[in-house]
Interface confidence: low
């Protein structure tokens, strides 16, 4: 039933300053929520290029309401980079979710509808902690 | 996972500061992340992240909720995790006085083209 197809809402959450100061690393979290059915492919793009290193994505989407057969789903992913890379304001981070709104097999056979395909993205820009030094700034630029 | 250093951090939405998620990270592989008993709180399974360029691996899980009383300090209460793993972020490190001071004392930066 194509009336039940819901594309995801996507948000990117910026690293905690506590993590940056404690570990010198920065984790961005991407959250895709409210989609049905559970056909999504999530990818991270940094400065326009897809990245795989430092990425971990949930092995499968989570039902938002486990008791419901046609519950909507959510999926999260993490991207971890060095603190200096995150603190370079020139660096652009994008979480892209490709959504395929496929319906069940028998419904496909009957209505022969095309899949509802959609790309939904959210983004963040690197953010200097304001009190940066030329050394940390240069490191961020060099590692970009 | 070498040198586990378990911590829970609160992350803010890049577009709206009133939304946040909780990140439980850097815990050892023996730690199990339990689902919440509250159906309005979502907790993911743990996954392993590999920062190949830094030869560094870490475990992590994420929790979030739309509930107004949801807090990162107790988001992972059903999991057996060490005390004091929640690291609250400072309000902001973008303090005008600090910024002025760093530009005063770092003359190299003053002459760099930041465009």
């Amino acid at each position: 039933d194509l009336n039940k197809v819901f594309p995801p809402e996507v948000a990117v959450f910026e690293p905690s300053e506590a993590e940056i100061s404690h570990t010198q690393k920065a984790t961005l979290v991407c959250l895709a929520t409210g989609f049905f059915p559970d056909h999504v492919e999530l990818s991270w793009w940094v400065n326009g290029k897809e990245v795989h290193s430092g990425v971990s994505t949930d092995p499968q989407p989570l039902k938002e309401q486990p008791a419901l057969n046609d519950s909507r789903y959510c999926l999260s992913s993490r991207l971890r980079v060095s603190a200096t890379f995150w603190q370079n304001p020139r660096n652009h981070f994008r979480c892209q979710v490709q959504f395929y709104g496929l319906s069940e097999n028998d419904e496909w056979t009957q209505d022969r509808a095309k899949p509802v395909t959609q790309i939904v993205s959210a983004e963040a820009w690197g953010r200097a902690d304001c009190g940066f030094t030329s050394v940390s700034y240069q490191q961020g630029v060099l590692s970009a | 996972i070498q040198n586990p250093d378990p911590a829970v951090y609160q992350l803010r939405d890049s577009k709206s500061s009133d939304k946040s998620v909780c990140l439980f990270t850097d815990f050892d592989s023996q730690t199990n992340v339990s689902q919440s008993k509250d159906s309005d709180v979502y907790i993911t399974d743990k996954t392993v992240l590999d920062m190949r360029s830094m030869d560094f691996k870490s475990n992590s899980a994420v929790a979030w909720s739309n509930k107004s009383d949801f807090a990162c300090a107790n988001a992972f209460n059903n999991s057996i995790i060490p005390e004091d793993t929640f690291f609250p972020s400072p309000e902001s490190s973008c303090d005008v006085k600090l910024v002025e001071k760093s530009f005063e004392t770092d003359t190299n930066l003053n002459f760099q083209n930041l465009s």
Partner: nanobody, 117 residues
Framework: EVQLVESGGGLVQPGGSLRLSCAAS????????LGWYRQCPGKERDMVAT???????DYADSAKGRFTISRDEAKNMVYLQMNSLKPEDTAVYFC???????????WGQGTLVTVSS
């Protein structure tokens, strides 16, 4: 898991024809859509044609009228008949399966098609 193996690529002259085959194995009951995609050197992978289990087809503009996608459900095969080939059709052609159950996305290793005189 679903495994996909393509065959049928090769060298063909402009205006010629070629038929690509893709054999699907494994958990094929999960598949909802099969498709052909192509990747030219230094470019992104682009959709060429897709077919659903209800036999609804979809084609890229560049493939309409020249290419035909079909499938043989009994043999778990999907085919791409390519006619009136042009040099710009030169690419690695990939078979892709979309599954109804996560993870939805499977790719074959690709087969090279070269259109040249």
């Amino acid at each position: 898991e679903v495994q996909l193996v393509e065959s049928g690529g090769g060298l063909v002259q402009p205006g010629g024809s070629l038929r690509l085959s893709c054999a699907a194995s494994g958990e094929v009951h999960k598949i909802n859509i099969l498709g052909w995609y192509r990747q030219c050197p230094g470019k992104e992978r682009d959709m060429v044609a897709t077919i659903t289990i209800g036999d609804a087809t979809d084609y890229a503009d560049s493939a309409k009228g020249r290419f035909t996608i079909s499938r043989d459900e009994a043999k778990n095969m999907v085919y791409l008949q390519m006619n009136s080939l042009k040099p710009e059709d030169t690419a690695v052609y990939f078979c892709r399966a979309l599954s109804r159950l996560y993870p939805y996305n499977y790719w074959g290793q690709g087969t090279l098609v070269t259109v040249s005189s």
